[in-house]
Each structure stands twice: as structure tokens, then as C-alpha cells.
Interface confidence: medium
């Protein structure tokens, strides 16, 4: 199936040009999306091209600037947030990145009623997190690991917590491992729907071992970065959840929410908090051995000023074949009765589907079913449930948006997006206004991305929000590669792959093959999305065939494929890449003497193991920031899939699955190993140990480090990295420069 046909016609060939590496590094062919910042059922904010903050009313068709670019520029603001009562805007500046989601910033409060910045009781700096209450204009913020509350922006702050301490106690923000591997947010506090209560997490990292690495900077002596970072099997953070009444915060103080007894009996995690009403909250907990999750619904007992979580409102989710959930345990979406909810989990056939839970999980009513998966529940209204899935035409790498009418019986299902722009758009996400009165659809491909606005009742398209016309015009004279998504059936396993082919691809010729791999548990690489990136350039200009393969352990094709890698990381992911390569060779257009593999992070681990598989298939390969031993990676992630590195659990496979154990096998391949020295995520230690093992085995290899760069290798390092990797591959494939 050719998804993005080349626009080459013989008459035009002389005006068409191939992609260049410069195009990719300059971001010449990047696309834009439009996500409305919804502020009501029919209004949204958007930052215009000239940096004004504009309010749009869909029903009146009117728009007006609520905040001028001049005001934004006066404090060098890069972000903003309107208070729900529309009286104030916070302006964010001095953005300073910390980890994947976290950053600190300076915040200024602008009073829209008088057109002035709020003076007096200004916010301290830098702030770790700040947010408005959902109603009115209360402010909660985190400063130096403690939480503060302001009833109004100009009021003095009320300090909620006092025990916050750098790298020790975190209030309202996650520590490193919770941020990266559990919450996937920079915050750990949650307002109740009307702003009566504020819930927050406290993380105690006192006993966690610390990862320390040098940050070279420009000084005479390097700095040492210290991060409490629990590696597999190490001591974990201790978490507690508190709720405070923000109307009278001083009267009673924060109340702790009890942990379910079956969870508290051994090491555990808090996984998410969902407010149901102002006096009902839902907490999700997870055993350290992550196959048991408990959802606990708690009610405020006014008279005792406590949160009560009766056992009858505890719902257990357990996996007998793998870990609980997909990448994370799914979160509930509550219905209007404020007790029943919709949730995605595995059905009896091992496919993730939407279930409706009214009393017990055992009595759950299955809402969707089939040999495909429901992926996200966007919104539940009184009469509709909107969700995404990969059901349509049985392509796991697609995403369409569906509506189920839950207000009528029997419920009927409608695909909202399947036939909108069928060739251009097969991978959607959505953003809904209050009560799903309107919604935006964002299509990511396979054609050029487009964002549109729709009526939530009729699904009619109202207008195009962003169609990337400039990008479309810029690509008119570019020889883009062809892309196809197909599947291989091997030993009862379906291996979906994406192949990127040179513009003048000829099946009778032989081409060098590059495998790009990620392959981590619950990931998906074969997706029907648009991209003009490094591999597009390699196909367009350098004439390579690039393939991406989703093997065992990858997502959205059922639990059999997903959980196949449980407790055995580094085995089947590698096998399936190798199997696919053999099938590609059989297709007849691959030069089997010129096959390479590359990957980043988990992909670096898989590419290293594939190179060291002893098959003789690969001439060369690249590992960027690879994991080299699961004992070096974070507890929350690693133990989810591997269990514990103890003798009575899974230590043997931890030891067997290292890259170092296969050092000898690198002798007959060209290996390029790359890592940032300030990688807080996959520590440089991983590559240092690979290099040491290769040296000890007297195996030649190439390496590049990026000083003071983290797991993303951003900025100028990106250019250097892709230039370096390009030279390496061209040399490996004997392509002239």
C-alpha cells in the first residue's frame, strides 16, 4: 500500500530535487498543528503568529486580543495561562529545563481588568510549578519543593507544606523516577473540580541511592549533578497523598488519604489521581511488582474531616500474563452519576477495550470488542463517549476517532474520522471543549498534517484551523521517498513494517537497507504519520531503503504480542528484527552485503544486540544512548517488564541480557556507539560499560560522546550527530560523499 506516492513525473524531473541533510537539520519541512486552548464550551484561546493571545468565539464568529504581544514581550513571556474567571493571566518567562517534563520559570500576574501587572506579594522565583484553580483565580504553586496557595493573585501566600527539601522531599512535584516513568508530568497536585480541595503527592527520596555525573561547563572544575535515581532493585521513593481544604487551609491542615491495605502490605507506587466531584476522589495504586493495580474511590467525611476509602469502592486490576495495563495503567473516565466509570483494560481475549464499571470489575460491561484495541477515551458526555482505536481496515498503526451513543439503547457506534480525508488522514487525535460542544481534530498523516474544527453534536467540519499550505508548496519540487506499510506473517506472529523507498525505486535493482528500531515494550514505530526526517533524506538522496518493524513486545495488537517479552527483554525484540531482515532479503531488492541497523535509547539496546547476534546479517550499526544492562536502568520502568534482579526472581535474565555479555560478537561488524555525558535518563555508565567490555575483548569500534548533553542530544549536537551518523553509514555502504 503506497501511502505517500512520489510526485515525480518524467516531464518534471529536472525541476525536482532530492532532500538534503541540511533540509532536515534546518527543519525546512516541519509541520504545524493547532490545538485550541479551550476556555468554555464555545471559546478558545490561541497564540497568533505575531504572539498576541486571541480569544475566539465559535458561535459568534468573533475574536479579540485579550493580551497583546507588547505585554508578552515586556516580561519576555514564552507561555501564558488565563484564570477561569478571566480576570488574570499568568505570564511565564525565564524557562529553564530540568528533566523531560519539568522546568522552572519566573511568573508574572497580569490583571486584565486594569491592564497592569499585579504589584505586591509578587511570586518568588524560580517557581517549579504554578496553576490556577479550576474556578475563580486561586493560585497553587511549588517553590523550593513546598506548596503555596494564594486566594487571589495579590494576596500573601499561605504555605501548605514545610518539609520540602532539594533531592529529599518533593511536595506537589514528582521526583525523577515518578516524573519519567509513572506520572509523565511536571506536577503532582490536582485541584478538585470547583477548587474546594487541593490534592498533592509527597515523595520522600531520603533513602534512594544517588546517580552522580560530571557536568563540565566552562569552569575550572566540573560540577557534579546528583539525582536520587532508583535503579532496578534499589530503594524506591515513599509516596503519600494529602488533600487540603483551600477555603480554610489553616483550620484543619492537609489530610492524608489512606492506602488500600492490599497495596500497603509491601512496596508500592501511586499511579494517578482523578477528581470525581469536589468531595469524591479516585486514586490509583500499584504494587512494586506491577501486575496488581488498585483503583480506590474515596469520599470526604465532613464531620470527621477525613477521606474515607471503603473497601467496597476498591477495584482490583490484575494481569496474569504480563504487567498491569499497557505502558501505564489506564485512568478512569467517570460518568455523570459520579460513581460508575469507563476504563480501558484487557478483555478475555487479551485485547485492550473499553469497559463500563458500575459496582465491581467482575461485573464490568464491555463496551468495545474485537481483534484491535481501544487506545484512548477522550470524553464522556451524558449521551456520547468519544474514543480512539486502530480498528479501521485492520491497520494497527492508524488512529481514528469514534463516537458511541451511550444515551440510547442499544448504543450505536460511528467512526467520526474514517472517511473524512481518507488518503491524507489516517492517524488522528482530538481535543474537546466543555461538554464536547465542539472539538478539534488533528490529523498527523500519512499526508501533510491538517487540523480542523468540528461541531460536537453533528460532527460537521466548521473550519480548517491549520492546513500547512506553506509546507505543501515547499514540498512540490522535492523528490520524497515512497512509503508503504505492510505485514509479514511468520510463525503465527504478525510483523507490521514500514518501508521507505527511494523516489525512483526499481524492484529489479539492489539497495542498501537500514533498519531503524526502537522496539521497547508497548511502543509502536509503524504508524501512518507524516514525517520528513533523517531517514527520509537517506532514502531520497542516498538511495537507501529504510525499514521499521514492530515485533513482539510492541503495542496495540493484543496482549499475546505485547506480553511476549515479559521477564525476557532483549530476546524476541531482536529475533523479530532479524526475521524481518531475512524476509526483506527474500523480496529481491536488498543488497545483503549492505545492511545496517540503528536505534536510540531502547532502540540502541536492540540494535547493539542485533549487531552482536552472530547472524552475519549486519555489516554495521549505530547505538545512540543505549541501555546496556537492565541493572543500570530505572526501577519503575525496568521492573515492570523484568521483575527484580534478585536470585529468587529474575537475576539470571538480567545478567544474560546485557550488551557486555556479547562483546566478542562485535568483532565482525562496524559499531558506532554514541552517548551524551549528562544523560540523566540512560546514564553514560551504560555506554562506558559497553566500551570497557569491547576494549577488554580487544574489539575495534567507533565512538562519539557529546559533552554535557542529555538523552535528547539537542541543539548543535543534533547537527553534529546526524552528520556523523550519515558519514558512518555512507562509508559502511560505500556511498560516495
Amino acid at each position: 500500500i503506497v501511502l505517500r506516492p512520489s510526485r515525480v513525473h518524467n516531464s518534471e524531473e529536472n525541476t525536482m530535487r532530492a532532500l538534503t541533510l541540511k533540509d532536515i537539520l534546518n527543519g525546512t519541512f516541519s509541520y504545524k498543528t493547532f490545538f485550541p486552548n479551550w476556555i468554555s464550551g464555545q471559546e478558545y484561546l490561541h497564540q497568533s503568529a505575531d504572539n498576541n493571545i486571541v480569544l475566539y468565539n465559535i458561535e459568534t464568529g468573533q475574536s479579540y486580543t485579550i493580551l497583546s504581544n507588547r505585554t508578552m514581550k515586556s516580561v519576555n513571556a514564552s507561555n501564558y495561562g488565563l484564570s477561569p474567571d478571566r480576570q488574570f493571566v499568568y505570564l511565564e518567562s525565564d524557562y529553564s529545563k530540568l528533566w523531560r517534563y519539568s522546568y522552572t520559570a519566573t511568573y508574572y500576574i497580569y490583571d486584565l481588568s486594569n491592564g497592569e501587572f499585579v504589584r505586591g506579594n509578587e511570586l518568588p522565583r524560580p517557581i517549579q510549578y504554578l496553576c490556577w484553580s479550576p474556578v475563580g483565580s486561586k493560585l497553587a504553586y511549588v517553590y523550593q519543593n513546598n506548596i503555596y496557595l494564594k486566594q487571589r493573585p495579590g494576596d500573601p501566600p499561605f504555605q501548605i507544606t514545610f518539609n520540602g527539601r532539594e533531592n529529599k522531599i518533593f511536595n506537589g512535584i514528582p521526583d525523577w523516577v515518578y516524573e519519567e516513568e509513572m506520572l509523565a508530568t511536571k506536577y503532582a497536585l490536582w485541584w478538585s473540580p470547583n477548587g474546594k480541595f487541593l490534592a498533592y503527592a509527597e515523595f520522600n527520596d531520603t533513602d534512594i541511592p544517588v546517580i552522580a555525573y560530571s557536568y563540565y561547563g566552562d569552569e575550572q572544575y566540573p560540577r557534579t549533578i546528583n539525582i536520587p535515581y532508583p535503579k532496578a532493585g534499589a530503594k524506591n521513593p515513599v509516596v503519600r497523598i494529602f488533600i487540603i481544604d483551600t477555603t480554610y487551609p489553616a483550620y484543619v491542615g492537609p489530610q492524608e488519604v489512606p492506602v488500600p491495605a492490599m497495596i500497603a502490605s509491601s512496596d508500592y507506587y501511586f499511579s494517578w489521581l482523578t477528581w470525581v466531584t469536589d468531595e469524591r476522589v479516585c486514586l490509583q495504586w500499584l504494587k512494586r511488582v506491577q501486575n496488581v493495580s488498585v483503583l480506590s474511590i474515596c469520599d470526604f467525611r465532613e464531620d470527621w474531616q477525613t477521606w474515607d476509602c471503603p473497601k467496597t469502592q476498591e477495584h482490583i486490576e490484575e494481569s496474569r500474563t504480563g504487567w498491569a495495563g499497557g505502558f501505564f495503567v489506564s485512568t478512569p473516565v467517570f460518568s455523570y452519576d459520579a460513581i460508575s466509570y469507563y476504563k480501558i483494560f484487557s478483555d478475555k481475549d487479551g485485547y485492550k477495550h473499553i469497559h463500563y464499571i458500575k459496582d465491581t470489575v467482575e461485573n464490568a460491561i464491555q463496551i468495545t470488542s474485537g481483534k484491535w484495541e481501544a487506545i484512548n477515551i477522550f470524553r464522556v458526555t451524558q449521551d456520547s463517549l468519544f474514543y480512539s482505536s486502530n480498528e479501521f481496515e485492520e491497520y494497527p498503526g492508524r488512529r481514528n476517532i469514534y463516537r458511541i451513543s451511550i444515551g440510547s439503547y442499544p448504543p450505536s457506534k460511528k467512526c467520526v474520522t474514517c472517511h473524512l480525508r481518507k488518503e491524507r488522514c489516517q492517524y488522528y487525535t482530538a481535543s474537546f471543549s466543555d461538554y464536547a460542544k465542539y472539538y478539534a481534530l488533528v490529523c498527523y498523516g500519512p499526508g501533510i498534517p491538517i487540523s480542523t474544527l468540528h461541531d460536537g453534536r453533528t460532527d460537521q467540519e466548521i473550519k480548517i484551523l491549520e492546513e500547512n499550505k506553506e509546507l505543501e508548496n515547499a514540498l512540490k519540487n522535492i523528490q520524497l521517498p515512497k512509503e508503504e506499510i505492510k505485514k509479514l506473517e511468520v510463525d503465527e506472529i504478525t510483523l507490521w513494517y514500514k518501508m521507505i523507498l527511494p523516489p525512483q525505486f526499481d524492484r529489479s535493482k539492489k539497495y542498501p537497507l537500514l533498519i531503524q528500531v526502537y522496539g521497547g515494550p508497548c511502543s509502536q514505530s509503524v504508524r501512518s504519520v507524516f514525517a520528513v526526517n533523517w531517514i527520509s533524506y537517506l532514502a531520497s538522496k542516498e538511495g537507501m531503503v529504510i525499514a521499521l518493524v514492530d515485533g513482539r513486545g510492541t503495542a496495540f495488537q493484543g496482549d499475546k504480542l505485547l506480553y511476549a517479552v515479559y521477564r525476557k527483554l532483549g530476546v524476541y525484540e531482536v529475533e523479530d528484527q532479524i526475521t524481518a531482515v531475512r524476509k526483506f532479503i527474500e523480496m529481491g531488492f536488498i543488497d545483503e552485503k549492505r545492511i545496517a541497523i540503528w536505534g536510540w535509547s531502547y532502540g540502541g539496546y536492540v540494535s547493539s544486540l542485533a549487531l552482536a547476534s552472530g547472524t552475519g546479517l549486519f555489516k554495521c550499526g549505530i547505538a545512540v544512548a543505549p541501555v546496556s544492562s537492565w541493572e543500570y536502568y530505572a526501577s519503575v520502568y525496568t521492573e515492570r517488564f523484568m521483575g527484580l534482579p534478585t536470585k529468587d526472581d529474575n537475576l539470571e535474565h538480567y545478567k544474560n541480557s546485557t550488551v557486555m555479555a556479547r562483546a566478542e560478537y562485535f568483532r565482525n561488524v562496524d559499531y558506532l556507539l554514541i552517548h551524551g555525558t549528562a544523560d540523566d535518563n540512560v546514564h553514560f555508565q551504560n555506554s562506558a560499560q559497553i566500551a570497557k567490555a569491547l576494549v577488554n575483548a580487544q574489539v575495534d569500534f567507533q565512538a562519539m560522546w557529546y559533552s554535557d548533553q542529555n538523552h535528547g542530544l539537542s541543539g548543535l549536537s543534533t547537527n553534529h550527530l546526524y552528520t556523523h551518523m550519515t558519514h558512518f553509514l555512507k562509508q559502511c555502504f560505500s556511498l560516495s560523499d
Epitope: A250, Y251, V252, G253, D303, W304, Q305, T306
Partner: nanobody, 121 residues
Framework: EVQLVESGGGLVQPGGSLRLSCAAS????????MGWFRQAPGKGRELVAA????????YYPDSVEGRFTISRDNAKRMVYLQMNSLRAEDTAVYYC??????????????WGQGTQVTVSS
Amino acid sequence: EVQLVESGGGLVQPGGSLRLSCAASGRTFSYNPMGWFRQAPGKGRELVAAISRTGGSTYYPDSVEGRFTISRDNAKRMVYLQMNSLRAEDTAVYYCAAGPLWQLYRSHGYWGQGTQVTVSS
């Protein structure tokens, strides 16, 4: 802030009765559940009675159930503990405390200085 002052302790014979009082000052009194705790020499602090904000519900451990009664008067900002059929093992320092029970169990919340109760013949 809540300040608490206990009174009514003393020496009593086994089988006898005592009524402890706790006077509270501070505007947040009525927002807080209240409890009486006790601590015998060489032992940990234990809860003997608790009462909700409005006085609508009470809690007693098995050891004092049926013998002790907790009550409160929000208008007067007072909490009382009526102790009947006293036994030698009830001998302890009795503390009045204000706050949700989980806080009090962790020695958070607001606490009085305590009043001594001795049951002896």
C-alpha cells in the same frame, strides 16, 4: 490555631468515676474532630475516645467501650470525657487533642499539656 487546656484529673478508687474537661480557644475549634488520648508510663500513646466536628458520631476502642463517653459543646468550645468503672490499667496522663484522627495518631494536630489520672485503692 487551637489552644487546649485539660482539667479534672486526679486520684480515684477502682470502680469510681471522673469527668475530664478540655477548654479550647481559637476560632478553628468547630472545624476539628476531637480526641482523648492517654499515655501510661513506659507505654505508647493510645486513643481512648474521639468525636466528630458536630458531635454526631463518636469512636471508642474496645478497651473503654461502654465505660467512657465523649461529648462536646461547640458553643462553649468544650470537650468532655466521662469515665466510669475505672480500673487500675486506666492510670495514665490523659491528653485532649484536636484534628482529624490520622493526624492525631501521628502526633500532629493540636494537643493539650495533659492531666494525670491515677486509679488506685
